[in-house]
C-alpha cells in the first residue's frame, strides 16, 4: 500500500512542464495525475527529470495502465523506456514499426539489453514473421541481430526479407543458422544472373550443400578464401581438386596459407596427392598414389 500524501496547495500539475523538475518525489506522486501524464508523454523527454523522478512517472503510468501500456503511450516513452523491465514489456502489444524505431533509438549505441530483446520478441511475435522492413530496422540498430536468433526463429523469416540482409549482419552466424538462411537466400536471389547472384549469395554460403558449390564452380565466380573457409566442411569434402580450383580461381593460391585449418585441412586429406600436386602449391597430406580410397559412408549404406 502506497503512503498517500495530499498535494500541497497550488502545486497541482496542470500540465507536464519544466516546473516539475523542482518537485520532490512525494510531490510528483501526489500532484501529477497519471491520466494527464499519458496525454502529454511527448513532453517528458524534453524535460531533464532525474532518474528518481522518472521512477515516479513510470509508477504513475503503471497505476493508470495495470495491464500494460497502450501503444499511444509506448511510442512516446523516450528515456522512460530505460526504466521498463522485461516483465513490463511483456504486457505490451507493439504493432507499429515507428514505435519500435523510437524505442530502439533510445538504446542506440548500447548493447542489446534484456528490455530491447523482449521488445523485439514481442514485436516480431505480434507480426507473425520477420518481414523485410522489420529486419531492415533491427539490423540497422543491431548488426548481429539475425545471428542472435535460433534456427527455429529464423525459419519464420520469409525469403523476401533476405534482401534486407547485409554481409556484416551474418558475421556471427553459426553453421546451424546459415543452414536455415541459405535456402531462403537461394530462393530470394534465384532470378539474378551469375555474377550478381554470387555477390548476393556469398555471405550465406556457409549453409550451402555440395551440389550448389559444384554448380558455382562452373560459373567462374572466384570465391575469396575468407568465404571458402566459412563453408561447411561436409560440403567441401566431396569437391574435387579441379572443382576447388575453378571455385577459387586466382584465390586458389591462398589454400597454402590455410592448409592446417578446417575445412582446407580435412579436404586435403580426402584428395589424391598427385591431384593436389597439379595445383603447384606444395600442399601435402593427400592420399599417396596407389592407395585405394574406400567410401565408408557408401559401404554403411549398402550394408
Amino acid at each position: 500500500e502506497v503512503e498517500k500524501t495530499a498535494c500541497p496547495s497550488g502545486k497541482k500539475a496542470r500540465e507536464i512542464d519544466e516546473s516539475l523538475i523542482f518537485y520532490k518525489k512525494w510531490e510528483l506522486e501526489a500532484c501529477v495525475d497519471a491520466a494527464l501524464l499519458a496525454t502529454q508523454m511527448d513532453r517528458v523527454n524534453a524535460i531533464p527529470f532525474t532518474y528518481e523522478q522518472l521512477d515516479v512517472l513510470k509508477h504513475k503510468l503503471d497505476e493508470l495502465y495495470p495491464q500494460g501500456y497502450p501503444e499511444s503511450v509506448i511510442q512516446h516513452l523516450g528515456y522512460l523506456f530505460l526504466k521498463m523491465s522485461p516483465e513490463d514489456i511483456r504486457k505490451w502489444n507493439v504493432t507499429s514499426l515507428e514505435t519500435l524505431k523510437a524505442l530502439l533509438e533510445v538504446n542506440k549505441g548500447h548493447e542489446m539489453s534484456p528490455q530491447v530483446a523482449t521488445l523485439i520478441d514481442r514485436f516480431v511475435k505480434g507480426r507473425g514473421q520477420l518481414d523485410k522492413d522489420t529486419l531492415d530496422t533491427l539490423t540497422a540498430f543491431y548488426p548481429g541481430y539475425l545471428c542472435s536468433l535460433s534456427p527455429e526463429e529464423l525459419s519464420s523469416v520469409p525469403p523476401s526479407s533476405i534482401w534486407a540482409v547485409r554481409p556484416q549482419d551474418l558475421d556471427t552466424c553459426d553453421p546451424r543458422q546459415l543452414d536455415v538462411l541459405y535456402p531462403k537466400a537461394r530462393l530470394a536471389f534465384q532470378n539474378m544472373n551469375g555474377s550478381e547472384y554470387f555477390v548476393k549469395i556469398q555471405s550465406f554460403l556457409g549453409g550451402a550443400p555440395t551440389e550448389d558449390l559444384k554448380a558455382l564452380s562452373q560459373q567462374n565466380v572466384s570465391m575469396d578464401l575468407a568465404t571458402f573457409m566459412k563453408l561447411r566442411t561436409d560440403a567441401v569434402l566431396p569437391l574435387t581438386v579441379a572443382e576447388v580450383q575453378k571455385l577459387l580461381g586466382p584465390h586458389v593460391e591462398g589454400l597454402k596459407a590455410e592448409e592446417r585449418h578446417r575445412p582446407v585441412r580435412d579436404w586435403i586429406l580426402r584428395q589424391r596427392q598427385d591431384d593436389l600436386d597439379t595445383l603447384g602449391l606444395g600442399l601435402q597430406g593427400g592420399i599417396p598414389n596407389g592407395y585405394l580410397v574406400l567410401d565408408l559412408s557408401m559401404q554403411e549404406a549398402l550394408s
Epitope: 498535494c7 500532484c31 497505476e63 493508470l64
Partner: antibody, heavy 119, light 108 residues
Framework: EVQLLESGGGLVQPGGSLRLSCAAS????????MSWVRQAPGKGLEWVSN????????NYADSVKGRFTISRDNSKNTLYLQMNSLRAEDTAVYYC????????????WGQGTLVTVSS | EIVLTQSPGTLSLSPGERATLSCRAS???????LAWYQQKPGQAPRLLIY???SRATGIPDRFSGSGSGTDFTLTISRLEPEDFAVYYC?????????FGQGTKVEIK
C-alpha cells in the same frame, strides 16, 4: 459482472455537508481510476472529480474545488465524495463511474443518488 | 478548460432515418480522448463510442463515430425506436474532463 452502487444522497440545507459512497464489485477496484459525474434536474452531464487507484491523485471541476473531496478505501472497494458548503446549484443526481484508461471513457456507471440542497 | 459544443440541440427524426450529431471542441482534441454516451430518461449514461470511432462493448454497428481535431461526429445509420435518447460527447484530454451540453434525438 461490474456493479456500482451509490448511496448517501438526500435532502440537505445550503451550507450543509453530505458524504456519498459508491460500493464497487465485479472488477479490480484497486487498479482502476474512479469518477463522480453529476446531472442537475433537466440538465446535462457535468464531470465532478476523479481519483487514481494507487496514489489517490485527485482532480476536480472548478465549480466544486475546495468544497468537495473525493477519496477511496481500496480495502473496502468503496469510493467516496465528501461534499461540504453545499449550494442550491449542487442539487443533482450524482453518478459514480469507472474510468477505463484503455478505452479512455467512463465504461460503467451506477444508477445515481439524488442530492437535494434546499432550505 | 476545453469547451465542447454539440449541435443541433434537438434532432427530430423518424425510425429508419439517419441521424448525424456534431460535437465541436474549443481546442484540438486528440481523437483517442473523445467519447460519446447515450442516456435514456431515468437511466444512467452508457458509453457508446471511445477514441472518437471505436464502438464500446455491445454497441450495435449502426452507431459510428468519426472526426479529428476540433470536429467530431456521431452517426446513427438507421434509427431504431430504442435509439431515441440524449447523446453527449466528452473529452478526457485535459482536466476537467468536460461534457458537451447534449443533443436530444426525438421521434418526429
Amino acid at each position: 459482472e461490474v456493479q456500482l452502487l451509490e448511496s448517501g444522497g438526500g435532502l440537505v440545507q445550503p451550507g450543509g455537508s453530505l458524504r456519498l459512497s459508491c460500493a464497487a464489485s465485479g472488477f479490480t477496484f484497486t487498479q482502476t481510476y474512479m469518477s463522480w459525474v453529476r446531472q442537475a434536474p433537466g440538465k446535462g452531464l457535468e464531470w465532478v472529480s476523479n481519483i487514481s487507484p494507487t496514489y489517490s491523485t485527485t482532480n476536480y471541476a472548478d465549480s466544486v474545488k475546495g468544497r468537495f473531496t473525493i477519496s477511496r478505501d481500496n480495502s473496502k472497494n468503496t469510493l467516496y465524495l465528501q461534499m461540504n458548503s453545499l449550494r442550491a446549484e449542487d442539487t443533482a443526481v450524482y453518478y459514480c463511474a469507472r474510468y477505463n484508461a484503455y478505452q479512455i471513457g467512463l465504461d460503467y456507471w451506477g444508477q445515481g443518488t439524488l442530492v437535494t440542497v434546499s432550505s | 478548460e476545453i469547451v465542447l459544443t454539440q449541435s443541433p440541440g434537438t434532432l427530430s427524426l423518424s425510425p429508419g432515418e439517419r441521424a448525424t450529431l456534431s460535437c465541436r471542441a474549443s481546442q484540438s482534441v486528440s481523437s483517442s480522448y473523445l467519447a460519446w454516451y447515450q442516456q435514456k430518461p431515468g437511466q444512467a449514461p452508457r458509453l457508446l463510442i471511445y477514441g472518437a470511432s471505436s464502438r464500446a462493448t455491445g454497441i450495435p454497428d449502426r452507431f459510428s463515430g468519426s472526426g479529428s481535431g476540433t470536429d467530431f461526429t456521431l452517426t446513427i445509420s438507421r434509427l431504431e425506436p430504442e435509439d431515441f435518447a440524449v447523446y453527449y460527447c466528452q473529452q478526457a484530454l485535459g482536466y476537467p474532463h468536460t461534457f458537451g451540453q447534449g443533443t436530444k434525438v426525438e421521434i418526429k
